[in-house]
């Protein structure tokens, strides 16, 4: 169908509550484009009827609410005047809330579930809520270890929980809860956050930590478009450079003529005591010569690589 495939990261989500994912890919969606969502390579688009439990809302896919059976790979197809890109998003739904049981709950703790408070300082936690503008979010309630937070050291300010004079007892499992209203119906959103306490001003010393990749291989079909993020945590005051290299050469220099493989523009999210940096590498079209080569993400003295490999042949097709 002429669409280039782009594989995005996995998302881990909680069942029985709303979830939304926005189909944005800056090089493409900045212009005049149409966006259509599909599930599991279905030819039938996700409904745009707002009464449907799963429906497309402008560039978003919206689940009201998410259910366990919604796990799977979703594709959004971005069509421009002269281009077509298919972005794949893998959604994994876990079934149980931590406060009800530890069984069948959050299967692993990725960075978005972790936040840090500084001992003895005034600090804050953030409730990350990402929904289209058709969703109205009510005031946020905060919980610690499954009990609503009360006390004069804690103040709720929009999406943040302000904590004054942080103590060691403030570590633990927090959750922020909001009521989301959509088309007159109300839904509860509950996000878990694991909070650790640190005395350090820096983030794990001055050596940057590469969260992803982790020195592994990625199966990718010949001819597809692939985007891989390098996610790095580092101190706020760091002077480290982050880049992608192949054969010890910057990818932009190595592929200077063809520009087939390019490094993306670096972005970062600022946390209380560190920054999370993202710089991607884009393979506009994977070629045979790319397989088996280590593509290295560098961040200061830290390095991590990915190696592209052809998927194993599926003999069931014959």
């Amino acid at each position: 169908d002429g669409c280039k495939d782009i594989f995005m990261k996995n998302e881990i989500l909680s069942a029985s509550q709303p979830f939304a994912f926005n189909c944005t890919f800056p090089p493409i969606t900045s212009g005049e484009v149409s966006v259509t969502w599909y599930k599991n390579s279905s030819k039938i688009p996700v409904s745009k009827i707002i009464q449907s439990r799963i429906h497309q809302d402008e560039t978003w896919i919206l689940f009201l609410p998410m259910e366990w059976g919604d796990s799977g790979v979703y594709q959004c197809v971005i069509k421009g005047r002269d281009s077509c890109h298919r972005i794949h998003v893998n959604l994994t739904v876990f079934e149980k809330h931590w406060c009800d049981t530890s069984i069948g709950g959050l299967p692993n703790l990725s960075d978005e579930y972790k936040q840090i408070l500084h001992l003895g300082k005034d600090d804050s936690l953030t409730c990350h809520l990402h929904f289209p503008k058709s969703c109205v979010l009510g005031p946020i309630k905060w919980y610690k270890d499954c009990n609503e937070i009360k006390g004069e050291r804690f103040t709720v300010l929009e999406t943040r929980l302000l904590v004054s004079n942080v103590s060691a007892e403030d570590r633990g499992n927090y959750a922020c809860q909001a009521i989301l209203t959509h088309s007159g119906k109300q839904y509860e959103v509950l996000n878990g956050i694991t909070v650790s306490i640190t005395e350090r001003a820096g983030y794990g010393g001055s050596v940057p930590k590469i969260i992803y990749p982790k020195n592994h291989s990625i199966e990718v079909q010949l001819g597809t478009t692939l985007i891989v993020d390098c996610n790095v945590t580092d101190t706020k005051d760091n002077t480290n450079l982050r880049c992608w290299r192949v054969n010890n050469t910057l990818v932009d220099d190595y592929y200077d003529e063809s520009k087939r493989i390019r490094e993306g523009v670096e972005t970062h999210v600022s946390f209380r005591e560190h920054n999370l940096y993202t710089v991607n590498i884009t393979f506009l079209e994977v070629k045979m010569e790319d397989y088996g080569l280590p593509f290295m993400c560098h961040a200061g003295v830290s390095t991590a690589y990915i190696i592209l490999q052809l998927p194993a042949p599926d003999f069931r097709a014959y």
Epitope: S102, L106, G172
Partner: antibody
């Protein structure tokens, strides 16, 4: 470092009750779930149930609902399991284990408490 | 409940040999919730492999785990004397939590 220290061995008569303790240290007790697992002599592992010290929520294996009662005392970071109406087939080593958010497995176990039921 | 069946019940091998044991679930278990424990006589179980294939802290890399759905495998590439013990598979996906009946790895 995380530690779970259980109470010592017990010998009980049939029909009696016993209360086993599990003292936690090295982490935020109310930010975990404590699970109880038993192992009869020469047998495998059998899950009894779990308790959340933060909100005192309990979930039991149906096979133990009328046998075990799990409680906590957060002031001393200790979990308890009481076994009632003891029978000889309740003779076993009883373990506590801890589970943390986003880590659905047992990274730390108590050393075990042997409960012997004999007339 | 999810029944986990381990095979073989007993595995008799010599140090230096390769050990392979399997665990079959009566219904599908997400790989994120499947784990292996090692237990030696008179000791509490010890987490060996979690999330199907990740080695727990301090576990030597001669141990490996694999599998998905209903079929999971634990492999020890080259047996050391301290590896002779009983191994249990475990699922954390559905209540009640269940364990396999164990595979006893003994010295031949």
């Amino acid at each position: 470092q995380v530690q779970l220290v259980q109470s010592g061995a017990e010998v009980k008569k049939p029909g009696a009750s016993v209360k086993v303790s599990c003292k936690a240290s090295g982490y935020s007790f109310t930010s975990s779930w404590i699970h109880w697992v038993r192992q009869a002599p020469g047998q495998g592992l059998e899950w009894i149930g779990e308790i959340n010290p933060g909100n005192v929520r309990t979930n039991y294996n149906e096979n133990f609902r009328n046998k075990a009662t799990m409680t906590v005392d957060t002031s001393i970071s200790t979990a308890y399991m009481e076994l009632s109406r003891l029978r000889s087939d309740d003779t076993a080593v009883y373990y506590c284990a801890v589970v943390f958010y986003g880590e659905p497995y047992f990274p730390y176990w108590g050393q075990g408490t042997l409960v012997t039921v004999s007339s | 409940e999810i029944v986990l069946t381990q095979s073989p019940g007993t595995l008799s091998l010599s140090p230096g040999e390769r050990a392979t044991m399997s665990c079959t679930a009566s219904s599908s278990v997400s790989s994120s919730y499947f784990h292996w424990y090692q237990q030696k006589p008179g000791q509490a179980p010890r987490l060996l492999i979690y999330r199907t294939s990740i080695l727990a802290s301090g576990v030597p890399d001669r141990f490996s785990g694999s599998g998905s759905g209903t079929d999971f495998t634990l492999t020890i590439s080259r047996l050391e004397p301290e590896d002779f013990a009983t191994y249990y598979c475990h699922q954390f996906h559905r209540s009640p939590l269940t364990f396999g009946q164990g595979t006893k790895l003994e010295i031949k």
